[in-house]
Structures are given as C-alpha cells and as structure tokens.
C-alpha cells in the first residue's frame, strides 16, 4: 500500500501537488501517482516551481532534515544523443508537453548530467536537508529515490469554506490526503468539523456545469456564528474587528449587514443592501501590500501568469505556502485562514471593487496561500 501524502496543496489554477516520502524507483513513483489519480509532477517555471518549492519548505521528512533527499519528478532524457549544452534542462525534458511553457527560471543542476546515447535517463529534485531545493540531479531510472512529487489537474476547485464557529476541521482529499486545511480543494474533498455543542458537520466539494461548490453549506460558513461578526472566516466580537489602522476588518454574519457607521453589523433591512447574504465594508481596499484583507465576498479571478514573487520567510513547519495569490493583506498579520480568503495570481481589486484580469494585469505581487497538510 502506498503511504498517504506527507504534504499537499492546491492553487486556484486548478493544479494540486503532493509530496511523498517513500523509497522507490522511478517506475514505481509514476505508478503511485497514477493510483492517486495524478501523474509524476512536472516542475516548470513560475507558479509551478514556486508551488513545489513551498511544499518542500514546509518541513523535513523522515530523518528530521539531517540529510539531502532526492524526489522523483517527471524529468527525463529520452534515448538518443541529447545535447547536454541545451540550456537550462541540458536536453532533459518534461514528460508532459506545455507548448507555451518557459524553462528560463528553472532550478540549476546540482551536477552536470553525463552524456549518454544509449539508455533513457531520469532526473530527480535534490533537496538539501530534505527541505531546501538544491536543483536537478541526474539519476538512473532503476535506482531508488527518497520520495516523489505528484501533480493533479482540475478544471475547477472549491475555495475553503469559512469555519464560522467550527472547530477540529479535517480535509480528506481524493488523492489520499488527510489534512487540517486546504485553501482550494478538488471535487470529492470532504471537510468535516465540529460545531458548537460538538455537533459534527460534513460537506463535500462537488462540481457540475456551473462550477464547484460545497454541498450542504449554507452561506459559505460551516457553522453559524452566535454573534454578528466574522473575521478571517471565524466568528468574532466587535472589539476584535478593528485593524491596526482602526479600520473595520470584519464582515457581517448571515442575517446582518453593515450599518451606516461602517463598523457595526445591524439586522438585515436596517442598514444597506447586502451582497450574497453578507455585509462587507463599504471602504474599498486598495490593492497594496499593506492594505487590510478584503473579506470573502470579493470575487477572485484565477491566473497562472505570475510575476516573480518572493518565497515565504520562516513559517511553521505544518504550514505549506504556495505563493500564488495576490498580496491583498499584510503577511505578518495573516493567519492561515486569512490567507485562504484569497486566491491565486494577479487578480487585484480596483478602487471600484472589481477584479483586474489575471491575464493582462501588470502587477506582480503575491501573497502566500497557506494550508496545514500534515498527513494522517
């Protein structure tokens, strides 16, 4: 039996990745990914590279980070005399094609691959201490690496439901992952939690012709709040709703809307019209690195064309960050769930509150999307 994923994560582009610690040959790694419904992962430039690096940096595997680890990826050199000078992959290529793919900002080679005209040759991703990616390393396909990376592709995902009053959240993804949080979940993912009074609740991500949503979820919240306010998706009290600048950082629970003062929630009908059953601050946050995090009702548009983004500094090992989402809030004050309120890429909010196209936007800032993905 194949072990469950040590870590996994999904981005709003529909791509999910899982990292597994298991000593096996390349062929066995390919089969293991296929059994999970995916394929051995490519690690191309840009968002994909950052996603995989984030998984690695989430924490060491077996051995506590004391040695270098080698992970099988979908990189190979077909039989025949490849050109070892062909930069940057030295003639190696990814198993699946991406006609528009750029390889310019790929990792370096730990050591130059040998020239060979006979056998198919494979390559691994070497991670220093098991967490810090060093680069590609040629490895004979029949040898055993320390682990492997899988990739899964979906047309649409379910953004994480807001907990509200829920506790003990648990995500079970279809690719055999049991996790404490996933910012984006593929169809088939089941989220279970406890509501107040220890009442269990379970919702499942389902996809149809309209898109993807959590069945049996009312108002985006797993468990309703006893009060009027939510902050970062969790129930909150009014005194906790002010940000560092004194702005209103909460949204109103279902049945309430933002009052005329712009910082209190009143019973629906007494204030102003609401959008999707929740009141949101009337103040439109500018799309800057230091602005408050917009609440969950902002629409998000997916993008895969990211500018260069800094990788996340020191984080708790149980949290994996994929830096593919807009820097809508200050990193230092964002909790895991706050980060899950945002989505991937260059979608930015304009002063009017609409979302700038991910595709022709020229902004390139991004905030990490975080999730705890300790395996069961």
């Amino acid at each position: 039996e194949h072990p469950t994923a040590d870590r996994a994560g999904c981005s709003a582009s529909g791509a999910c990745y899982s990292l597994h610690h298991a000593t096996m040959k390349r062929q066995a790694a390919e089969e293991a990914c296929i059994l999970r419904g995916g394929a051995l992962s490519t690690v191309r430039a840009g968002a994909e590279l950052r996603a995989v690096l984030a998984l690695l940096r989430a924490g060491p595997g077996p051995g506590g980070g004391s040695k270098d680890l080698l992970f099988w990826v979908a990189l190979q050199l077909p039989p025949g005399c490849g050109d070892p000078k062909r930069l940057p992959l030295r003639g190696f290529s990814w198993l699946s094609s991406d006609p528009g793919g750029l390889e310019s900002d790929t990792l370096q080679w730990v050591e130059e691959p040998q020239r060979s005209c006979t056998a198919r040759r494979c390559a691994v991703l070497q991670a220093t201490g098991g967490v810090e990616p060093a680069g590609w390393k040629e490895m004979r396909c029949h040898l055993r690496a320390n682990g492997y990376l899988c990739k899964y592709q979906f047309e649409v995902l379910c953004p994480a439901p807001r907990p509200g009053a829920a506790s003990n959240l648990s995500y079970r993804a279809p690719f055999q992952l049991h996790s404490a949080a996933l910012d984006f979940s593929p169809p088939g993912t089941e989220v279970s939690a406890l509501c107040r009074g220890q009442l269990p609740i379970s919702v499942t991500c389902i996809a149809d012709e309209i898109g993807a949503r959590w069945d049996k979820l009312s108002g985006d919240v797993l468990c309703p709040c006893p009060g009027r306010y939510l902050r970062a998706g969790k129930c909150a009290e009014l005194p906790n709703c002010l940000d560092d600048l004194g702005g209103f950082a909460c949204e109103c629970a279902t049945g309430f809307e933002l009052g005329k003062d712009g910082r209190s929630c009143v019973t629906s009908g007494e204030g102003q019209p609401t959008l999707g059953g929740t009141g949101v601050p009337t103040r439109r946050p500018p799309a800057t690195a230091t602005s408050p995090v917009p609440q969950r009702t902002w629409p998000i548009r997916v993008d895969e064309k990211l500018g260069e983004t800094p990788l996340v500094p020191e984080q708790d090992n149980s949290v994996t960050s994929i830096p593919e989402i807009p820097r809508w809030g200050s990193q230092s004050t964002m909790s895991t769930l706050q980060m899950s309120l945002q989505a991937e890429s260059k979608a930015t909010i304009t002063p009017s509150g609409s979302v700038i196209s991910k595709f022709n936007s020229t902004t390139s800032s991004a905030t990490p999307q975080a999730f705890d993905s300790s395996s069961a």
């Epitope: 979906f154 047309e155 649409v156 898109g211 985006d220 998000i300 895969e304």
Partner: antibody, heavy 127, light 106 residues
Framework: EVQGVESGGGLVQPKGSLKLSCAAS????????MHWVCQAPGKGLEWVAR??????????YYADSVKDRFTISRDDSQSMLYLQMNNLKTEDTAMYYC??????????????????WGQGTSVTVSS | EIVLTQSPAIMSASPGEKVTITCSAS?????MHWFQQKPGTSPKLWIY???NLASGVPARFSGSGSGTSYSLTISRMEAEDAATYYC?????????FGAGTKLELK
C-alpha cells in the same frame, strides 16, 4: 495576453464541409474547457459546442441543431481547438467564435464563465 | 431547453439616466452571466454569476436576480455603455443566450 485566433472560415456550398481552427495562446490551454459560439449576421449569440479538458476526459457537448454534423476537438500539444463542420446548411452561416471557459472564485464556490473570445471567423453557406 | 427572454429588445437612454435590462428564464436557473458586444467586435464577459463584475467593468454596472428573473442595471448611463447586452445561462444543456438588448445613447 490571452488570445484565440480563429481560421478556416469561408464560402462553402450546402452539404459541404469546413474545418475551423483556433490557435490559443497566453494561457495554459490544456487545463481549460473551450467552446465554439456562433452569431448569424445581425442576430444574437448561439452556443455551438463545448469540449472539456483532459482532467474531464475531453467530454464534449453540442447544441441540438449541430449534433451529428459538427465535431469539436482539441490538440493540447499545439494549443489548438477545432470544429469539424459537415453537411452544412444555409442556416449555419455565421461568425464563429472560439471561447475560453474561465474559472472565477467567489465566496466558497468556483464558477465557470466564457471569459475570453477570439475575433471570430466567418462561415458562409450558400449555393 | 431553457429559453431566455430579454426585454426590452431595443432601448435608448440619456447620459446619467438609470438603465435596467431584464432577462427572464423559462425555467429556474442558478446564475446568470451577462456579455457586452459592440458592433464589429467580439462579445466580452461583463457580469458573471449574476452579480460579479468582470475585469475592467465600471462600478456603475450591477447585476441581480434569482430563479427565473434576472437584471443588469447601469446606475448612470454613459456614452461608452451603448452596446448590445446578452444574458446567458449554464444551468443546463444546451447553454443558451438571450436574444440581446440593444442599448443606444439618446
């Protein structure tokens, strides 16, 4: 920049055939579902066909009016979308657009929407 | 199939005027998308999932509705808003569009 450039349109006789192509660029084509939508001269928009991505087994869907006559297909390695049109009728005369099906996230849901349209290729069926 | 009926078919509005275009579905649909098309150009996604403005759409536009009744509203008409607007449902196959509402500047 996301683009879809259609080609292959032209004048064809009734019962004839035509193959439309759409060269997509600026996005990861193989992860998106795609559509063909047509617009007869001076008329409204009419959905023709949809093809999903590999992750959904390239499932295809058609408008009743084109079923068994038109075939939508794709070549992910070339980022190409196709529409094979057989047994053409005069009422098929229209501008044909290749359309990307984008995904938008709002709240805890994801929504499909036809978000990028090519410039269109004109098909005229006439004797 | 679900038939979408837009009204009015043609209308004109003066700058600053409030404009409402409605779309009625023959059966209940979950959401409605709206597209804008100007002569000689391809349609553009304008409002998705009933009420969300697509990229670059001015805030004077809004969308609302549920079930069989949906609408697109312009709070204050501007010259650049003159175009044809189409509603579209994707709750069931075949995907269908409304016949369009041509909005002219008075």
């Amino acid at each position: 920049e996301v683009q879809g450039v259609e080609s292959g349109g032209g004048l064809v006789q009734p019962k004839g055939s035509l193959k439309l192509s759409c060269a997509a660029s600026g996005f990861t084509f193989n992860t998106y579902a795609m559509h063909w939508v047509c617009q007869a001269p001076g008329k409204g928009l009419e959905w023709v066909a949809r093809i999903r991505s590999k992750s959904n087994n390239y499932a295809t869907y058609y408008a009743d009016s084109v079923k068994d006559r038109f075939t939508i297909s794709r070549d992910d390695s070339q980022s190409m979308l196709y529409l094979q049109m057989n047994n053409l009728k005069t009422e098929d005369t229209a501008m044909y657009y290749c359309v990307r099906e984008g995904v938008y996230y709002y709240g805890s849901s994801g929504y499909y929407a036809m978000d990028y349209w090519g410039q269109g290729t004109s098909v005229t069926v006439s004797s | 199939e679900i038939v979408l009926t837009q009204s009015p078919a043609i209308m004109s509005a003066s700058p600053g005027e409030k404009v409402t275009i409605t779309c009625s579905a023959s059966s209940s649909v979950s959401y409605m998308h709206w597209f804008q098309q100007k002569p000689g150009t391809s349609p553009k996604l304008w409002i998705y999932s009933t009420s969300n403005l697509a990229s670059g759409v001015p805030a004077r536009f809004s969308g609302s509705g549920s079930g069989t009744s949906y609408s697109l509203t312009i709070s204050r008409m501007e010259a650049e808003d003159a175009a044809t607007y189409y509603c579209q449902q994707r709750s069931s196959y075949p995907l269908t569009f409304g016949a369009g509402t041509k909005l002219e500047l008075k």
